[in-house]
Interface confidence: low
């Protein structure tokens, strides 16, 4: 049988000799040469010789575990003579012994890693890792220690699993943003005699919100014109934070002060300042200065800090209203007045008031616009404002007026205000009453007396308080042996009555009637109106058939019967129906 | 990037529970007051509650529709948000956001939203 | 409850049209109003908050303004990504939205 025990043989050999592995023996072999020795398998004749008289295996060339850390070969032991083996083919190993030939090599050459400024002490930042290729089974070539070359105080690693963790207090990023730390991984648990590499890592604090936002003055000053509009900007404040990114982020408010309501601040999101705009109109003759108490303060806050104290930060911001000149101003935004009809040339209606807002209170002089009274019905003093008239009124024609009145500055022209003006001119009983329209009517030559033929009625240009009150009558002359009558039935309207049975035509074919109508206003105005009666034949039944030789004839012009498209009072129809009549000739 | 990410949504009969997440990422949710709001199909938008952060003692308000059968909670160390919603009605039937609340009280990030349909 | 009550309800506009929405709340809010953009099927986006702060990243075209109950958002030229609907909102004394605006294609 086969004799030997499994070969070991040290990697990296430096000798200049062949390196002794070990010897193939056979309990068959008797020493005298009849056996012969052969060595096949992994490197056989290359890497590993065998002398086929003795078994001695040599290694020819100097072996890296770490490349091949075990051999496999087939060992043979032939009888010379006979050509046979003496011992069944065997498989044997070498393995291959370590050295620590390797240092510890970092899976990165350089580690970027960040971590919050202000980080409780050990804080975890980042892991490094180290590999040694030597037998981590064998010895201590490949257990590495971690440790810390350059970045204390404020940092340590963990000398077994390579872990970085803050180990200082307090490390403001404000102060200082970066660390570079400088890692070792020493093989042979770091005893003297290891092997050892080395690594970057280039750590950056992140941001956190631990400083307040600052005014770098604890008074601002701006001027604005009293003319701003809502919206104007008039300055910019800023506060600084040493911070970045959101935590350096400023919300701008105003937290008190007298202007308030008159102001506003608003954050410019690029520059983080705040702007301070006009909020309502400004009058520098009311108020000339503002002082605002502006209040700036972070919008993402972290807790944690608050110890720290309120992170916000005022400032008092004066603000110096500048006057411009304004144009003068009246005392209302309209004026109504009002005058009778029948006013006298130059009566006075009433004035208006304008004055200078500005502090000077520049002299005013006024005047009307012409655009809005081409008539010149009315003028102003120039002086007090007193609006008089220049020409009769009449409220017939125009009830309202609407005129406008300009203030000038005296010693600035380029200043002016206009206002409106409404004068409403007032009724006065300037109008007689008369007719609503021409009267022509007929009676029948058979008509029987007190019968109602024609109804009439008034219209008034004026327009009384009380409303229309007419009286109508048969004028004087008229009156006595009239052989009609007039019947005031008190409503405003009056009827013609007939005031004997029967008229014949051929004796009087027509009768002009003189109304008089009256109002009861004052003074009393009246006019007379005169209404055409015509006698005409009827049938028995009230029908017009002639009356002379001529048709009647409507206001309009159109030859009507008496009906329906002439309209008699309805107690006409009593005596005959609607019917259109025949020329005569 | 600030991300606000809500799931659990899904069809539940009425008088039924339903339990919504809201996952935030790229800030310090510990740090903010979280609301949730909702929006009724082809509706407005409406503010259910909020909660605050652990500073202010993480105090809950609800609106009056919701109050006695809703419940907001945190978990901080998983950065997530939870609604609790009991005794669903089919009024209840919206599109669920969750949305930070940021400093001068407006909401400046949201969730893309969760459907809740309350149906028998 | 503090009510809002936007208007109008819906607008057509063109783009480069300037468009206005107002809000107003049932009793004064400070400057505590907040305005949305929402798109269908979007959540909402902040754009103006504490009634005249733009949101960072917002485009300087929009505006916004008022105090105390009355406010507005005015678009100074509409874009073709501007049209949606447009929420209000108060954070005074808890919250409330206004009904919305839907700002349409003329």
């Known amino acids: 049988s086969w004799m030997w025990n499994q070969f070991f043989l040290l990697e990296e050999y430096t000798g200049s000799d062949y390196q002794y592995v070990g010897k193939l023996h056979s309990d068959q072999d008797r020493g005298d040469g009849s056996l012969k020795y052969i060595l096949s398998g992994d490197g056989a004749g290359d890497l590993f010789i065998i002398n086929e008289n003795t078994g001695d295996i040599q290694a020819t060339k100097r072996l890296d575990r770490e490349e091949k850390p075990v051999y496999i070969l087939r060992a043979q032991a032939i009888n010379r003579r006979t050509g046979r083996p003496v011992e069944p083919e065997s498989e044997f190993i070498i393995k291959i012994h370590d050295i620590n030939d390797n240092e510890p090599i970092f899976t990165k050459d350089v580690y970027t890693a960040t971590v919050p400024e202000m980080a409780d002490v050990g804080t975890f930042v980042v892991q490094v890792t180290a590999t040694d290729a030597d037998d981590p089974t064998y010895g201590n070539s490949a257990k590495v220690v971690y440790s810390i070359l350059q970045g204390q105080p404020y940092f340590s690693v963990e000398s077994e699993t390579g872990i970085i963790k803050t180990a200082l207090l307090n490390m403001d990023r404000e102060n200082r943003e970066q660390y570079q730390v400088v890692i070792q991984a020493k093989d042979m648990g770091g005893q003297m005699g290891g092997l050892s590499g080395t690594t970057t890592v280039n750590i950056t604090l992140t941001d956190v919100n631990d400083n307040p936002p600052r005014f770098p003055q604890s008074t601002y000053q701006f001027k604005t014109p009293e003319s701003s509009p809502p919206g104007t900007p008039i300055g910019r404040i800023k506060a600084s934070d040493a911070d970045v990114g959101e935590n350096a982020e400023i919300e701008y408010s105003i937290t008190d002060g007298e202007g308030h309501d008159m102001f506003d601040v608003i954050t410019d999101q690029e520059t983080q300042e705040g702007i301070i705009t006009v909020k309502k109109l400004l009058d520098f003759e009311k108020k000339r200065v503002y002082t605002l108490k502006v209040e700036a303060s972070n919008p993402h806050i972290e807790p944690r800090f608050l110890y720290l104290g309120p992170f916000k930060d005022s400032a008092t911001v004066r603000i110096v209203v500048d006057d411009v000149d304004e144009p003068p101003v009246f005392s209302k935004l309209a004026y109504i007045l009002q005058i009778r009809e029948d006013a006298q040339i130059n009566t006075t209606i009433g004035s208006v008031a304008a004055q200078d807002p500005d502090a000077a209170r520049n002299p005013v002089k006024y005047s009307v616009d012409r655009h809005t009274d081409m008539d010149r019905i009315f003028n102003i003093d120039s002086g007090n404002g007193s609006i008089f008239t220049s020409k009769l009124l009449d409220r017939e024609t125009l009830l309202w007026h609407n005129i406008t009145v300009i203030a000038t500055e005296i010693n600035n022209p380029k200043q002016s205000s206009r206002v409106p003006l409404y004068i409403k001119v007032l009724d006065v009983n300037d109008n007689a009453p008369e007719f609503a329209e021409f009267y022509e009517t007929f009676v029948c030559e058979k008509a029987k007396a007190d019968q109602l033929i024609q109804t009439l009625h008034a219209v008034d240009k004026d327009d009384p308080y009380s409303g229309h009150q007419f009286s109508f009558s048969l004028a004087p002359e008229a009156a006595s042996g009239s052989n009609f009558t007039i019947q005031d039935n008190k409503d405003n309207t009056a009827g013609i009555l007939t005031r004997k049975n029967g008229y014949n035509r051929h004796e009087m074919s027509t009768y002009l009637l003189p109304v008089v109508i009256s109002d009861n206003d004052y003074p009393v105005q009246s006019s007379t109106g005169t209404v055409t009666v015509r006698v005409c034949a009827c049938d028995h039944h009230g029908n017009m058939q002639s009356c002379h030789a001529e048709a009647l004839i409507h206001p309009t012009g159109l030859s009507t019967g008496a009906g329906s498209e002439f309209r008699h009072d309805s107690g006409l129809n009593d005596i005959f129906e609607a019917q259109k009549i025949e020329w005569h000739e | 990037q600030v991300q606000l990410v809500e799931s659990g949504g899904g069809l539940v009969k009425p008088g039924g529970s339903l339990r919504l997440s809201c996952a935030a990422s790229?800030?310090?949710?510990?740090?903010?007051?979280i609301s949730w709001v909702r929006q009724a199909p082809g509706k407005g938008l409406e503010w259910v509650g909020f909660i605050k952060s652990n500073a202010d003692g993480y105090t809950t308000n609800y609106a009056a529709p919701v109050k006695g059968r809703f419940t907001i909670s945190r978990d901080d160390s998983k950065n997530t948000l939870y609604l609790q919603m009991n005794s669903l009605k089919t009024e209840d039937t919206a599109v669920y956001y969750c949305?930070?609340?940021?400093?001068?009280?407006?909401?400046?990030?949201w969730g893309q939203g969760t459907l809740v349909t309350v149906s028998s | 409850d503090i009510q809002m009550t936007q208007s109008p309800s819906s607008l057509s506009a063109s783009v480069g049209d300037r468009v206005t929405i107002t809000c107003r709340a049932s009793q004064t809010i400070n400057s505590y109003l907040n305005w949305y953009q929402q798109k269908p099927g979007k959540a909402p986006k902040l754009l103006i908050y504490r009634a005249s702060n733009l949101q960072s990243g917002v485009p300087s075209r929009f505006s916004g303004s008022g105090s105390g109950t009355d406010f507005t958002l005015t678009i100074s030229s509409l874009q073709p990504e501007d049209f949606a609907t447009y929420y209000c909102?108060?954070?005074?004394?808890?919250?409330?939205f206004g009904q919305g605006t839907k700002v349409e294609i003329k």
């Open positions: 909102q108060q954070g005074d004394s808890s919250w409330t």
């Open positions: 790229g800030f310090t949710f510990s740090s903010y007051a």
């Open positions: 949305a930070r609340i940021r400093y001068f009280r407006n909401w400046d990030y």
